[in-house]
C-alpha cells in the first residue's frame, strides 16, 4: 500500500564487479523520489542516496566494511516535494533487494596482462593485481589481497604462427611456462574462483603478444 | 542435481567420423571448463582436451589435435566430441567431466567407441 | 610435456591396513595434483585435489601429501570399498597428464 500517486521500486538488482557495487531499479520516476537502506543481516539500517530522482545507488563504501557478510538494501519511494508522505500504513513505500554477499557474488572484472618477460626458454608472465575498494589498515587492498588463494588465473597461450593453444594455472600472479627459442607467443589470462557456484569467471583479457610493448627478452 | 551424461558412442569403421555428445543439466556449462577423458579398453585415464563454452577456447593434448574438435552449445547446454579419421587405436570409453579449475567434480557414466572393420 | 609416474602399478593389501601410492612429476607442478579412485565399469570419482585437500564426501581416512614433484594418497585403514584403482592427475599445465594408476586388490 502507499499513497495513490507514488510506485514501489521493483527488479531491485545488484551490478557489482571487483567489490565496486551498485544497486539498480526501476522505474524510472515520475513525480516521486527515492531513498535506499542498507544494512547486514544483523545490523542496523544505514539510508544512502537521500530522495534520488536516480535509480541506482553506489552502496560501495557499505560493503566494502566486510565483503563477507550478506546484505540487504530496500528502496523507498516518496511523492516529490512531499517526502514526510506516508503510505496508508504510516511509512513509506517500499521494497526489498535479494540478498547479496560479495564475496562470493561480486563479478572478476576482466584481468590486464601487466608484462611478459622471456629468458630463453622460459616466459614469466604477469597478470595486474587489480586495487580494490576494499580497505585493510588505511589502505586499499588488491584483488589477491581479497581473495588469496581462493582466486586463480588461467593462462591461454599460443604460438602467434599457429591456432594450437596452451594453458597453464596459478594461484599467484605469476605464470612461468616454457616456450620454444626463437617463436613469438601470445597471451591471454581469465580469473576463476574454483570455489563459487555463480559468477566464477572473468571474461578473458586483452590478447598480448611478444614482440609488442609490453615484453621484455633476455638471452 | 548436477548430471552429466554421454551419448553417440557406438561401432564405426577405420576411417569413419563419430560425435559424441555430454548433455549437462544441474547447472550451466559455460560457468565450467568442460574435458574429455578417454579409457581404452583395460588401459588407464587418457586426457583428450577441454572447452571454456562460455569463450569457445579450447586446448587439446597435441596428439589430438589434428583429428578431434571440442566444441558447445550453451544453448543446449552440451558439449560436443568430435572425432574424425578413426582408428582402432581410438576404441575406448569417452567421459566427459566438469572442471571447476580445481579438480574434475563431476563424470558422466562413460560412452563406448568400438573402431573396427 | 608432464609425466606422471605412478607406483606401484598395483598392490595387494588387507582391510585395515595402511595403504600408500605415490606419483612422481617430471617436473615442479606446484600442489595442481588431484587423486581419483575408479572401480570397474564405473566414472572416475574425485579424493583429492590441490594435492592436501579432501573433497567433499570423502572418507577422511583418505590423505595426500607434496608439493613441486613428489606426491601421495595414503589410506590410512583399508576398507572393503577401497578396493579399487587410483589415478593421479596434474592439471597445472596442458596438456594434463594422468599416472597409470594404481590397482588395490585383496590379499
Known amino acids: 500500500s502507499g499513497t495513490t500517486n507514488t510506485v514501489a521500486a521493483y527488479n531491485l538488482t545488484w551490478k557489482s564487479t571487483n567489490f565496486k557495487t551498485i544497486l539498480e531499479w526501476e522505474p524510472k520516476p515520475v513525480n516521486q523520489v527515492y531513498t535506499v537502506q542498507i544494512s547486514t543481516k544483523s545490523g542496523d539500517w544505514k539510508s544512502k542516496c537521500f530522495y534520488t530522482t536516480d535509480t541506482e545507488c553506489d552502496l560501495t563504501d557499505e560493503i566494502v566494511k566486510d565483503v563477507k557478510q550478506t546484505y540487504l538494501a530496500r528502496v523507498f519511494s516518496y511523492p516529490a516535494g512531499n517526502v514526510e508522505s506516508t503510505g496508508s500504513a504510516g511509512e513509506p513505500l517500499y521494497e526489498n533487494s535479494p540478498e547479496f554477499t560479495p564475496y562470493l557474488e561480486t563479478n572478476l572484472g576482466q584481468p590486464t596482462i601487466q608484462s611478459f618477460e622471456q629468458v630463453g626458454t622460459k616466459v614469466n608472465v604477469t597478470v595486474e593485481d587489480e586495487r580494490t575498494l576494499v580497505r585493510r589498515n588505511n589502505t586499499f587492498l588488491s584483488l589477491r589481497d581479497v581473495f588469496g588463494k581462493d582466486l586463480i588465473y588461467t593462462l591461454y597461450y599460443w604460438k602467434s604462427s599457429s591456432s594450437g593453444k596452451k594453458t597453464a594455472k596459478t594461484n599467484t600472479n605469476e605464470f612461468l611456462i616454457d616456450v620454444d627459442k626463437g617463436e613469438n607467443y601470445c597471451f591471454s589470462v581469465q580469473a576463476v574462483i574454483p570455489s563459487r557456484t555463480v559468477n566464477r569467471k572473468s571474461t578473458d583479457s586483452p590478447v598480448e603478444c611478444m614482440g609488442q610493448e609490453k615484453g621484455e627478452f633476455r638471452e | 542435481e548436477v548430471q552429466l551424461v554421454e551419448s553417440g558412442g557406438g561401432l564405426v569403421q577405420p576411417g569413419g567420423s563419430l560425435r559424441l555428445s555430454c548433455a549437462a543439466s544441474?547447472?550451466?556449462?559455460?560457468?565450467?571448463?568442460m574435458h574429455w577423458v578417454r579409457q581404452a579398453p583395460g588401459k588407464g585415464l587418457e586426457w583428450v582436451g577441454w572447452?571454456?563454452?562460455?569463450?569457445?577456447?579450447?586446448i587439446y593434448d597435441p596428439k589430438f589435435q589434428d583429428r578431434f574438435t571440442i566444441s558447445a552449445d550453451t544453448s543446449k547446454n552440451t558439449a560436443y566430441l568430435q572425432m574424425n579419421s578413426l582408428r582402432a587405436e581410438d576404441t575406448a570409453v569417452y567421459y566427459c567431466?566438469?572442471?571447476?579449475?580445481?579438480?574434475?567434480?563431476?563424470w558422466g557414466q562413460g560412452t563406448l567407441v568400438t573402431v573396427s572393420s | 610435456d608432464i609425466q606422471m609416474t605412478q607406483s606401484p602399478s598395483s598392490l595387494s593389501a588387507s582391510v585395515g591396513d595402511r595403504v600408500t601410492i605415490t606419483c612422481k612429476a617430471s617436473?615442479?607442478?606446484?600442489?595442481?595434483l588431484s587423486w581419483y579412485q575408479q572401480k570397474p565399469g564405473k566414472a572416475p570419482k574425485l579424493l583429492i585435489y590441490?594435492?592436501?585437500s579432501l573433497a567433499d564426501g570423502v572418507p577422511s581416512r583418505f590423505s595426500g601429501s607434496g608439493s613441486g614433484t613428489d606426491f601421495t594418497l595414503t589410506i590410512s585403514s583399508l576398507q572393503p570399498e577401497d578396493f579399487a584403482t587410483y589415478y593421479c592427475?596434474?592439471?597445472?599445465?596442458?596438456?594434463?597428464?594422468f599416472g597409470q594408476g594404481t590397482k588395490v586388490e585383496i590379499k
Open positions: 567431466a566438469r572442471d571447476t579449475a580445481a579438480y574434475f567434480d563431476y
Open positions: 590441490y594435492a592436501t
Open positions: 617436473r615442479d607442478i606446484k600442489s595442481y
Open positions: 572447452i571454456d563454452p562460455e569463450n569457445g577456447n579450447t
Open positions: 544441474g547447472f550451466n556449462i559455460k560457468d565450467y571448463y
Open positions: 592427475l596434474q592439471d597445472g599445465e596442458s596438456p594434463f597428464t
